[in-house]
């Protein structure tokens, strides 16, 4: 649903996008994800900030918490207890890393309309959650875990060894948060709240990254983070489970690590409860091509957890690393022993498999030269998943239902024909037992969220259709977008091209390549966006291209694992190849080609600029990695192995940006980094700058004091304004 193209007579009433539009978020869209609390009910915060319960079956809506109550403690978030008696209100949000934050929590009794007094929660809390049944509370405070049977009860302290930057209980350390769990928590309730499992991370021996935080004081603070870089000592992880009904009885019981994993450095990758007395743990060797899924059972007689070897399932990759970005997690079926899981099939495509006894005997559920991406829900008779199968576009996502109750299983695409032009990239959110579900369509047209019946797939209502956005865009000259592919030497390079509104193939345009290119990423997606590059096409008349080269995801293992142990080679080659093909199309001014990227994209853009091809006039690297020896162990070693002589040290050294300093002499280079980047440390850009200075190569640079990897707030405006000036100057466009 892009606003319709208009005739020339109307074009004078239409305007181009401005940089201000982008920085103000004028054309941002809304999505609607129901906060499901049962099979047919969800909570949603209304426009006036009341918390409202919607019942799909009865058609009724009930305000359960008033905006007045929310405002009384400045709450920015809430969480309802499963017994519906209490709600936690979250305030004083203080961001830590990507997912983690601390907050103050208040417990409100919905039945009597009062805050729970007595035995109040300490502050600030690192993580808090309700049990899945009733209203028990588990929380993490100062790296220790506490349990409350009821909100007003005194807490029971589960762990005692928590220590800042040393021992983390129930929350991950930096590297596990960013590179393994992708959550702020490391504790998991069993389905009925009988047991609580948690991870303990010991960071005692991990080297510490230290950087200055300038703040406003006379002396800067030093931020210290245990951060294992490639090859360094890693955190040591243990998993414990405690009976929350009688927590003092035997205390936390450690879950044993599979012998084949424990024999050398390893990671814990995820925990999935199957029943109250069965749990599934996933482990990974430090050399991340072997993963073990271990199913453990509670032994009532010994009050311990037993993980028999017969319930260990090994997943191994011979061509790359295990899994995609992460090793996939299992979705268990109702028999509580068999499960569905996505992993590579014999042809090297990620597909859903059904594992009943052994991985070797797995039954393949989906197949084809496309990939299954996520399993949303398994019910008694259906499995819902997403894939990029439809019409062979890897950058699309549709939701499918496979009937598992009947044989042979039948497959139905739930979304493929709903709003075919507007919606080609979906995700979904399911209620209990998949009684109902919400579909969230991200594009390519204006996003729309809808509610559906889980049995019939009938659309019940539109939850959010972004009408205001649609109206706002009616007088905007948006760029045209096209997604196509290049076939080069048996490699398919999908690309997205963003073209100026009055694009004319007979004219020549400056070209900007936007690159990310990291392993298992995907940039060419059929999604809606009005962002900086939209502005550059709409107002400044640039052509922008995004290319998914080798190492990118969802097109099979051949493309994905091509970069294994060789980061920084093929990703760059494929961007260059694509640029040459774009030049051949005839509408690119080959004297005005630029490349830019952020993070991994900054690394690729830097290497592309330093490739010596003469293709690029200028480029920008924002917060780039410059050497893989500087980046996190978990991420880096997954793709590069270890930086040791007997492993892959040679390529670690060959693939640095610094090694190519001389090649920057004939390009205009803008290097940008936040000084408080906890993720890709400022060290990376400092070393590039040092190498360029030592090589006597001129370049431009901008640092953002006290900013992290996201360069947020006012820095964002400054950043995009600065980059715009740089590009316009490079392309000789008047200001």
């Amino acid at each position: 649903l892009r606003p319709p193209r208009v005739h020339n007579s109307e074009e004078n009433t239409m305007r181009a996008l401005t940089l201000k539009d982008i920085l103000n978020g004028t054309f941002s869209y809304k999505t609607f994800f129901p906060n499901w609390i049962s099979g047919q009910e969800y909570l949603h915060q209304s426009a006036d900030n009341n918390i409202v319960l919607y019942n799909i079956e009865t058609g009724q809506s009930y305000t359960i918490l008033s905006n007045r109550t929310m405002k009384s403690v400045n709450a920015s978030n809430y969480g309802l207890s499963p017994d519906r008696q209490f709600v936690y209100l979250e305030s004083d949000y203080s961001k830590l890393w990507r997912y983690s934050y601390t907050a103050t929590y208040y417990i409100y009794d919905l039945s009597n309309g009062e805050f729970v007094r007595g035995n109040e929660l300490p502050r600030p809390i690192q993580y808090l959650c309700w049990s899945p049944v009733g209203s028990k509370l588990a929380y993490v405070y100062q790296n220790n875990i506490y349990l409350k049977q009821r909100p007003g009860d005194p807490p029971f302290q589960i762990t005692f060894n928590g220590r800042e930057n040393k021992i983390f209980n129930g929350i991950p350390d930096w590297v596990y948060e960013e590179e393994m769990l992708a959550t702020k928590y490391a504790l998991w309730w069993s389905p009925n709240g009988k047991f609580l499992a948690y991870a303990e991370f010991n960071d005692t021996d991990i080297p510490v990254i230290a950087y200055s935080y300038y703040g406003d004081e006379q002396y800067p603070r030093t931020i210290n983070i245990p951060y294992p870089k490639a090859g360094a000592k890693n955190p040591f992880v243990r998993i414990f489970i405690i009976d929350t009904t009688y927590p003092a009885y035997v205390g936390p019981q450690e879950v044993p690590v599979p012998a084949m994993i424990a024999s050398s450095d390893y990671y814990f990758s995820w925990l999935t409860w199957v029943t109250d007395e069965r749990v599934c743990l996933q482990w990974l060797k430090r050399v991340q091509n072997v993963s073990v899924l271990s199913i453990c059972d509670f032994r009532e007689d010994w009050q311990t957890w037993d993980c028999p070897k017969t319930q260990e399932h090994i997943e191994e990759s011979r061509t790359g690393w295990a899994g995609g970005f992460f090793v996939s997690t299992p979705v268990f079926s109702y028999d509580a022993i068999s499960y569905y899981k996505i992993f590579s099939d014999k042809d090297g495509y990620k597909h859903i498999h059904y594992i009943k006894d052994t991985v070797e005997n797995a039954i393949q559920i989906t197949s084809g030269k496309w990939e299954a991406i996520n399993i949303f829900r398994v019910t008694q008779d259906s499995l819902f998943y997403s894939s990029n199968e439809f019409e062979d576009y890897p950058g699309r996502r549709n939701i499918y239902r496979i009937s598992i109750g009947s044989y042979p299983p039948s497959k139905k695409c739930v979304t493929c024909h709903l709003r075919k032009e507007r919606c080609q990239y979906y995700t979904a959110s399911f209620s209990d037992y998949a009684k109902y579900y919400a579909l969230v369509c991200y594009g390519p047209g204006i996003p729309i969220s809808t509610l559906h019946d889980g049995r019939t797939d009938q659309e019940i209502k539109i939850l959010e259709e972004n009408k205001e956005l649609e109206n706002a865009l009616k007088n905007i000259q948006l760029p045209k977008e096209e997604i196509k592919k290049l076939e080069v030497d048996e490699i398919t390079l999908w690309y997205k091209m963003i073209l100026p509104p009055q694009f004319d193939r007979s004219k020549k345009y400056p070209l900007l390549i936007q690159v990310y290119g990291g392993p298992c990423s995907q940039s060419v997606r059929s999604v809606f966006a009005v962002n900086w590059i939209s502005y550059l096409a709409s107002k400044e008349g640039m052509v922008i291209a995004l290319v998914d080269g080798r190492g990118t995801a969802f097109q099979g293992d051949k493309l994905l694992y091509a970069v294994y142990r060789k980061l920084g080679v093929y990703e760059v080659e494929d961007q260059i190849t694509a640029v040459r093909k774009f030049i051949e199309m005839g509408f690119i001014d080959e004297k005005r080609i630029a490349i830019w990227g952020w993070s991994y994209g900054g690394y690729v853009s830097s290497l592309a600029l330093a490739s010596g091809t003469g293709l690029f006039k200028c480029g920008i690297a924002v917060a780039p990695v410059s050497s893989w020896e500087y980046y996190a162990s978990v991420y880096t070693e997954r793709f590069m192995g270890l930086p040791t002589k007997d492993d892959n040290l040679e390529h670690y050294k060959n693939s640095t940006v610094m090694a190519r300093a001389e090649y920057f002499r004939n390009v205009d280079y803008l290097l940008i980094h936040g000084t408080a980047d906890d993720n890709v440390h400022f060290q990376n850009s400092a070393q590039i700058a040092k190498a360029l200075v030592n090589a006597q190569v001129d370049f431009q640079a901008m640092w953002y004091s006290d900013q992290n990897h996201g360069l947020s707030g006012l820095s964002t405006n400054h950043l995009y304004t600065h980059m715009t000036h740089f590009l316009k100057q490079c392309f000789s466009l008047s200001d």
């Epitope: 079956e57 305000t63 008033s66 039945s111 309309g113």
Partner: antibody, heavy 120, light 107 residues
Framework: EVQLVESGGGLVKPGGSLRLSCVAS????????MNWVRQAPGKGLEWVGH??????????DYAAPVKGRFTISRDDSKNTLYLHMNSLKTEDTAVYFC???????????WGQGTLVTVSS | DIQMTQSPSSLSASVGDRVTITCRAS??????FNWYQQKPGKAPKLLIY???GLQSGVPSRFSGSGSGTDFTLTISSLQPEDFATYYC?????????FGQGTNLEIK
């Protein structure tokens, strides 16, 4: 502690009117959906009607026997629920209870009831 | 309107007995169904919500089951204080009708 206290019952002639009150305490009255339920002497419970919270639109629903004759209203500033009864009939004789409809679909708290007798 | 048919209308039993009361809805009400207990001269008291949920403070000898149109209240071992009148109620859609009640008396 949640409390509901009804008042206003008494003897009234057929065709007459009466207003019952229910004062609430111990919970957020303004967000509550409030109900009236009655019980004729020696008989079972009969749902009379309810009023939604103002936040949820404040609309009312009534049982067929009282529709058009009874009106439920509320005054959130006074934490009070009302039942305005007009054109009373002898079959309206009952103990009238006010109760809270909690959003897990139950009448979880009840008042002690007030007796209305319609008799000539 | 949804009709609720409760049976039996009265029941004699002894302390320690297992007692079952049933209720049938005239159309499917899923689990929007509750049981109440009322003693003479008192207001009703919620026992079971959502067909099978035990209200806080209610003894575990009371249990509820059913979904759709047929529902059951079971008292596993009658105690002296359980002799009262029991009502079922649907809360699926207004009017929120009650069953006619079951009077449980001492044999």
């Amino acid at each position: 502690e949640v409390q509901l206290v009804e008042s206003g019952g008494g003897l009234v002639k057929p065709g007459g009117s009466l207003r019952l009150s229910c004062v609430a305490s111990g919970f957020t009255f303004s967000l509550a959906w409030m109900n009236w339920v009655r019980q004729a002497p020696g008989k079972g419970l009969e749902w009379v009607g309810h009023i939604k919270s103002r936040a949820d639109g404040g609309s009312t629903d009534y049982a067929a026997p009282v529709k058009g004759r009874f009106t439920i209203s509320r005054d959130d500033s006074k934490n009070t629920l009302y039942l305005h009864m007009n054109s009373l009939k002898t079959e309206d004789t009952a103990v009238y209870f006010c109760s809270r409809f909690y959003w897990n679909y139950v009448l979880d708290y009840w008042g002690q009831g007030t007796l209305v007798t319609v008799s000539s | 309107d949804i009709q609720m048919t409760q049976s039996p209308s009265s029941l004699s039993a002894s302390v320690g007995d297992r007692v079952t009361i049933t209720c049938r809805a005239s159309q499917s009400i899923n689990s929007y169904f509750n049981w109440y207990q009322q003693k003479p001269g008192k207001a009703p008291k919620l026992l079971i919500y959502a067909a099978s949920g035990l209200q806080s403070g209610v003894p575990s000898r009371f249990s509820g089951s059913g979904s759709g149109t047929d529902f059951t209240l079971t008292i596993s071992s009658l105690q002296p204080e359980d002799f009262a009148t029991y009502y079922c109620q649907q809360s699926y859609s207004p009017p929120y009708t009650f069953g006619q009640g079951t009077n449980l008396e001492i044999k």
